[in-house]
Interface confidence: low
């Protein structure tokens, strides 16, 4: 049965060419995490595998930076970045979970973290 | 490789208050979240709370509004401050980290709810 919760940073905001860190966190299980997958949209940006460490997927590699822990940082962001974003999380022996966090790159220099909260 | 020692567990009547502390040594703040878990007797280990080095913070449902967790990075040290403590709260609590992105587990400490 799988007990576990996805919790994210949930909405946020940047400006153009900043950076941000997207971040999840697995909760409410002992499940044992073996991969740690990113995407955007139909995407892979990267993979963070338990024994064999991560990967960035070469289209993203100057941009892309892993972590912190689980999480992935996002540079020289244009505002083709906006969108969503989801962290895959395969366990055993629960399974895959899912969390979702949507990405705004302004323009502007107002830019601001919105609300931090649990995607359902 | 990542050490952990929890410490602040004991005996307390219901209603009461404790604070558990987990000193980690190696690098453990690189970025990675710290937290706790619990088991009480007889029953599976369950997740009670987690701290981001940023300061986020998430607590299971049974703790909310009595609980805080919280750390120092100085120190690579995480607290677990309990109040309106219930003899269902009784357990053996552990830390955890994942700093490098995968679990270590401290030795635990015991607390005990009880009039």
């Known amino acids: 049965m799988m007990t576990g919760t996805i919790e994210t940073t949930g909405n946020i905001s940047a400006e153009k060419g900043g950076s941000i860190i997207l971040q999840c966190h697995l909760s409410s299980t002992t499940a044992q995490v073996t991969q740690v997958n990113w995407e955007q949209q139909d995407q892979l940006l990267a993979i963070c595998n338990a024994d064999l460490g991560w990967h960035i997927s070469p289209s993203f590699k100057d941009r892309v930076a892993p972590g912190p822990g689980l999480g992935l940082t996002l540079q020289s962001l244009t505002v083709n970045d906006t969108g969503e974003y989801f962290c895959i999380y395969h366990t055993y022996p629960d399974g895959t979970y899912t969390g979702r966090i949507f990405l705004e790159v302004l323009e502007s220099s107002v830019a601001e973290h919105g609300a931090r909260f649990q995607i359902p | 490789e990542v050490q952990l020692v929890e410490s602040g567990g004991g005996l307390v009547q219901p209603g009461g208050s404790l604070r558990l502390s987990c000193a980690a040594s190696?690098?453990?703040?690189?970025?990675?979240?710290m937290g706790w878990f619990r088991q009480a007797p007889g029953k599976e280990r369950e997740w009670v709370a987690s701290?981001?080095?940023?300061?986020?913070?998430w607590y299971a449902d049974s703790v909310k509004g009595r609980f805080t967790i919280s750390a120092d990075n100085s120190k690579n040290t995480a607290y677990l401050q309990m109040n309106s403590l219930k003899p269902e709260d009784t357990a053996v609590y552990y830390c955890?980290?994942?700093?490098?992105?995968?679990?270590?587990w401290g030795q635990g400490t015991l607390v005990t709810v009880s009039s």
């Open positions: 701290v981001l080095r940023g300061g986020y913070t």
């Open positions: 190696g690098n453990t703040f690189s970025g990675g979240f």
């Open positions: 955890t980290t994942e700093g490098s992105g995968w679990r270590n």
